[in-house]
């Protein structure tokens, strides 16, 4: 019997994986090193897939190798001494200059360079740079970028306001419809802020005498109704209103006179007025009752070549006349005339002229007050400095308002450098059918009186005082205000402006940048303004948009139900 050879020679086991080989009777047994398996230890055990030791016990990456394995870490982590667990590298602590001027924030396996809102990180310069949101078309109309943010603006002068999303624009809507019906039979005397509304020339037989009859309606207390003069300017007659009463001034080769008389007729009612030249006097009648008789030695206007030539001007006079008046008068008159008969010639073609011109037509119904149609402004130059007052300048304002649209600038002070150091505006509230009153210094809102029902039949009354130290609201309302510290900063801006030149604007803003104020829409509605105890008369303005009515306000469009005519009782003028 032959001897059975050693089964371990030649070696049947996998050299890499075996630990020992044991010879048996016609067989062999390979004992494997850890990490190997199989009859010949030829198979590597994948420790990373061992269900009894998940992921080989590695916290992150398990790398299987022939007969073994090892753990490794993802980028941004380091291996702990146990060779299994990974720890996050805090790059921010390790390299403090990683983010330059930005804030380094450690995140698992990495880091982030953080910038404040409105800024973004520039990898190249390792700094935070302002995001120009305006270049990303964030706003519907106008966008102003500033460090760390942006603001959208809408063209209020074209009737737009910023929508609630603070990006898009929407039309400023009517909150109180007004009766803007006009009639061409009614001649509006205040069509022009400066200038004559109508000019007529009469050539009549020499036996003619001057006469004028008309119905007249106004709330204005002063102004020129009509002015008549001879062709050579040597004689003239002025029919005006002063202190609400009829005034007549006349001058010719024989005499020079001024007379005021009769009842006050600026009551908003139609009054029939007649001025007639008699042989020895001029007779003035109101409602067919004589109120004045002015003696005259000869004819008012001297005929020439068998003709009496007369020029008649409505609501004004030629510029050169101003210096010739016996008593100066502000010619501006907000009123209406109808049923006129001049020089006994009836309406004689005037109606045809007026019919074509919408802006010469008068409103059918008006109330006392001033009306801002949302298309222009009035400018005043007011001295707010009070020599006797230790505080220096002061602004005491009373506003009586009846808005027709819920957004617009009511009052603004504008500096010579086109900033708006003070403004009082109306803004449609976020709560439906109500408005906020906003007081601003430049483009910062310093006071907000929220959710008032201002669009109502009744007028609302608002009163406040401002000086360099304080803003005091005298109307008992809930106010949302900025911090006292911030208020002082803003009042300091106002104080600086008040030491220079400021112009006062009513009803809106002149041409200043959109971004100069939080609101830039024109005010639409009725408003009376009292500043430092003086009731502002729009006829006395430095300039005024022709559409603003100085002494007449359209009536509210009559609704069948007055359910929406509730006004905050605290705002009703108690006077």
């Amino acid at each position: 019997v032959n001897a059975i050879p050693d089964q371990c020679s030649p070696l049947p086991c996998n050299e890499d994986g075996y630990m020992s080989c044991k010879d048996g009777k016609a067989s062999f047994t390979c004992t494997c090193k850890p990490g190997w398996q199989g009859e010949k230890c030829e198979f590597d055990i994948n420790e990373c897939k061992d269900p009894s030791n998940i992921n080989g016990g590695c916290s992150q990456i398990c790398d299987n190798t022939p007969g073994s394995y090892h753990c490794s870490c993802k980028s941004g982590f380091v291996m702990l001494s146990n060779k299994k667990d990974c720890k996050d590298v805090d790059e921010c602590s390790l390299k403090p200059n990683m983010c330059g001027t930005a804030v380094c924030k450690n995140i698992p396996g990495d880091f982030e360079c953080e910038c404040p809102e409105g800024y973004r990180y520039n990898l190249k310069s390792k700094s935070c740079e302002d995001v120009d949101e305006c270049s990303e078309n964030m706003c519907a109309q106008l966008c102003v970028n500033y460090p760390g943010g942006y603001t959208c603006y809408c063209d209020g002068k074209k009737g737009f306001k910023l929508a609630q999303d603070q990006k898009s624009c929407e039309a400023v809507s009517v909150c109180l419809p007004l009766n803007l019906d006009t009639k061409y039979e009614l001649l509006y005397l205040a069509e022009q802020f400066a200038g004559v509304v109508l000019y007529l020339k009469f050539r009549l037989p020499e036996i003619s005498r001057f006469s004028a009859e008309f119905d007249f309606r106004t709330y204005d207390s002063q102004g020129v109704i009509l002015y008549a003069e001879s062709i050579d300017h040597s004689a003239w007659l002025l029919i005006a209103l002063r202190g609400g009463k009829i005034e007549v001034q006349l001058k010719n080769e024989h005499t020079s006179k001024i007379t005021t008389g009769g009842d006050i007729i600026n009551n908003g009612l139609w009054n029939m007025v007649s001025v007639e030249e008699l042989e020895h006097s001029i007779s003035i009648k109101i409602a067919k009752e004589a109120v004045m008789d002015i003696n005259k030695p000869g004819p008012l206007f001297k005929p020439e070549n068998g003709l009496l030539e007369t020029k008649v001007y409505f609501a004004g006079f030629p510029r050169k006349v101003e210096s010739e008046l016996i008593k100066p008068i502000n010619p501006r008159l907000d009123g209406c005339i109808r049923s006129w008969n001049l020089m006994k010639q009836g309406a004689s073609g005037i109606k045809e002229i007026i019919q074509e011109k919408q802006n010469k037509h008068c409103l059918v119904t008006v109330e006392k007050g001033s009306y801002y149609p949302g298309s222009g402004i009035a400018e005043f130059h007011i001295d707010y400095n009070n020599g006797s007052n230790a505080e220096g300048w002061h602004i005491n304002v009373t506003l009586n308002i009846r808005p027709s649209m819920g957004t617009g600038v009511m009052l603004a002070l504008v500096s010579s450098n086109n900033t708006v150091p003070f403004a009082v505006s109306l803004v449609d509230s976020t709560s439906e059918k109500s408005q906020d009153i906003v007081i601003s210094v430049e483009n910062t809102v310093i006071y907000r009186i929220q959710a008032l029902s201002l669009c109502s039949n009744q007028r609302s009354h608002l009163e406040f005082r401002v000086n360099r130290n304080n803003l005091e609201l005298l109307t008992p309302l809930k106010i949302e205000t900025i911090s006292q510290e911030e208020l002082q900063t803003q009042l300091a801006i106002l104080d600086k402006a008040m030491k220079g030149k400021v112009a006062t604007y009513l009803g809106g803003l002149p041409d200043v940048p959109f971004s100069a104020t939080p609101v830039n829409a024109f005010y639409n509605g009725c408003m009376e303004v009292n500043i430092n105890g003086v009731e502002l008369d729009l006829d006395e303005a430095i300039s005024k948009h022709n559409d603003i009515r100085a002494h007449s306000c359209p009536s509210v469009w009559k609704k069948t139900k007055n359910s929406e005519d509730q006004v905050d009782p605290r705002l009703i003028d108690g006077k």
Epitope: K95, N97, M98, Y121, N122, K124, K126
Partner: antibody, heavy 117, light 106 residues
Framework: QVTLKESGPGILQPSQTLSLTCSFS??????????VSWIRQPSGKGLEWLAH???????RYNPSLKSRLTISRDTSSNQVFLKITSVDTADTATYYC?????????WGQGTTLTVSS | QIVLTQSPAIMSASPGEKVTMTCSAS?????MYWYQQKPGSSPRILIY???NLASGVPVRFSGSGSGTSYSLTISRMEAEDAATYYC?????????FGAGTKLELK
């Protein structure tokens, strides 16, 4: 006037270490906002960014090559260096250094490396 | 890493024609750069920080875009504009380039 010029060995054998130098003038790498990058471009192919060194000596690397790359600088001699270990044929390319800074961005003309056994 | 995809890969245009090429990013980027490369030359910077024209670059070149979508426009193609154009993002590391758009003269 800003100029950058790259220099290198031209030819290397696989597994050798590549040493590149970028010599520049017209600016100082110690000025805030300045930085120099290395970029390479295999012939007829696209551009690949390798590494960047900032004015404050902060360094950034392309993760896919990080273990083989070292960027450094010598501000006194106006030079930036790049070392790539264990090169192989895939590293054959034109290597550019580029200035990214406050005054604009400028690239050198490039230096060509061929890895061949 | 942010992947930049340029399209088209190749295009041709006649002199005077308006040319627009795009660069799309796999995630939002803040700063995009555009380079022009002609055979045998190193890349030349055209546009930095998305829309700023680099010094000495003709005004017919303009860049625009935001987020993940960017474009380079040549208002009127000229013969010398025939080249390969690359976009590059400078928003996060690793810095990456697009594969390029080759613009040929028709």
């Amino acid at each position: 006037q800003v100029t950058l010029k790259e220099s290198g060995p031209g030819i290397l054998q696989p597994s050798q270490t590549l040493s590149l130098t970028c010599s520049f003038s017209g600016f100082s790498l110690s000025t805030s906002g300045m930085g120099v990058s290395w970029i390479r471009q295999p012939s007829g192919k696209g551009l690949e960014w390798l590494a960047h060194i900032y004015w404050d000596d902060d360094k950034r690397y392309n993760p896919s090559l990080k273990s083989r790359l070292t960027i450094s600088r010598d501000t006194s001699s106006n030079q930036v260096f790049l070392k790539i270990t264990s090169v192989d044929t895939a590293d054959t390319a034109t290597y550019y250094c580029a200035l990214y800074g406050n005054y604009g961005d400028y690239w050198g003309q490039g230096t060509t490396l061929t890895v061949s056994s | 890493q942010i992947v930049l995809t340029q399209s088209p890969a190749i295009m041709s245009a006649s002199p005077g024609e308006k040319v627009t090429m795009t660069c799309s990013a796999s995630s939002s980027v803040s700063y995009m750069y555009w380079y022009q490369q002609k055979p045998g030359s190193s890349p030349r910077i055209l546009i930095y920080d998305t829309s700023n024209l680099a010094s000495g670059v003709p005004v017919r070149f303009s860049g625009s875009g935001s987020g993940t979508s960017y474009s380079l426009t040549i208002s009127r193609m000229e013969a010398e504009d025939a080249a390969t154009y690359y976009c590059q993002q400078w928003s996060s590391y690793p810095l990456t380039f697009g594969a390029g758009t080759k613009l040929e003269l028709k």
